[in-house]
Amino acid sequence: DAEFRHDSGYEVHHQKLVFFAEDVGSNKGAIIGLMVGGVV
């Protein structure tokens, strides 16, 4: 299963920094409970 990334990790909304939880690098387990890679 592939994981995808937002195209920017942080965006300013009304002067508030919002973290896009998925833009954190490929295949690092950003999606809760999604099996990524193999057993390591």
């Epitope: 937002h6 690092k28 387990g29 809760i32």
Partner: antibody
Framework: QVQLVQSGAEVKKPGASVKVSCKGS????????VHWLRQAPGKGLEWIGR????????IYTPKFQDRVTMTEDTSTDTAYMELSSLRSEDTAVYYC?????WGQGTLVTVSS | DIVMTQSPLSLPVTPGEPASISCRSS???????????LYWYLQKPGQSPQLLIY???NLASGVPDRFSSSGSGTDFTLKISRVEAEDVGVYYC????????FGQGTKVEIK
């Protein structure tokens, strides 16, 4: 068998702190993020935050920002979640999740 | 915070019959990259939750294809084409466009 094994149930007084552990068994915990969630009795799921064990980077939900600390010990494949200034509303089952694996949950009861 | 609202909160089902759960988000979960950041989880009785669907329509590994999900930016539906006894539990929708928030859950039980 690959699994995440959490520490046992805890009973704490209001104002105290609790530290829950999550150990990877047959699983290298430093490769993937470790998420922490909780579920109060009869309630839904609530995300607390996550840690990248590779570099210690954390992201916390603003609600918990001032009270939670997530750490890891890669030498023992164990992640930790410490919650301070406990109140009765923190009574819940706390879960760790990494990749497709979920811990069995740790019941934390806050009661005077 | 993005608020996720599910309906119904309780759903009695008949094995072999279809079932559907609705979820609405307070903000569009469709990002400009084309991905919709909507997820479905199932918590079976006495178990930890499990991921069913990720990014609105992708089936997680090992999830039977009787489960499917569709929707727009704010309105989503999880469908079970033919309910089986093992499908009982509490279903949660969730988003991670901005951190993670979950719906209040829909309890599915056999009639």
């Amino acid at each position: 068998q690959v699994q995440l094994v959490q520490s046992g149930a805890e009973v704490k007084k209001p104002g105290a702190s609790v530290k829950v552990s999550c150990k990877g068994s047959g699983f290298n915990i430093k490769v993937y993020y470790v998420h922490w969630l909780r579920q109060a009795p009869g309630k839904g799921l609530e995300w607390i935050g996550r840690i990248d064990p590779e570099n210690g980077e954390t992201i916390y939900t603003p609600k918990f920002q001032d009270r939670v600390t997530m750490t890891e010990d890669t030498s023992t494949d164990t992640a930790y979640m410490e919650l301070s200034s406990l109140r009765s509303e923190d009574t819940a089952v706390y879960y760790c999740v990494s990749s497709g694996y979920w811990g069995q949950g740790t019941l934390v009861t806050v009661s005077s | 915070d993005i608020v996720m609202t599910q309906s119904p909160l309780s759903l009695p089902v008949t094995p072999g019959e279809p079932a559907s759960i609705s979820c609405r988000s307070s903000k569009s979960l469709l990002h400009r990259n084309g991905i919709t950041y909507l997820y479905w989880y199932l918590q079976k009785p006495g178990q930890s939750p499990q991921l069913l669907i990720y990014q609105m329509s992708n089936l997680a590994s090992g999830v039977p294809d009787r489960f499917s999900s569709s929707g727009s930016g704010t309105d989503f539906t999880l469908k079970i084409s033919r309910v089986e006894a093992e499908d009982v539990g509490v279903y949660y929708c969730a988003q991670n466009l901005e951190l993670w928030t979950f719906g209040q859950g829909t309890k599915v039980e056999i009639k």
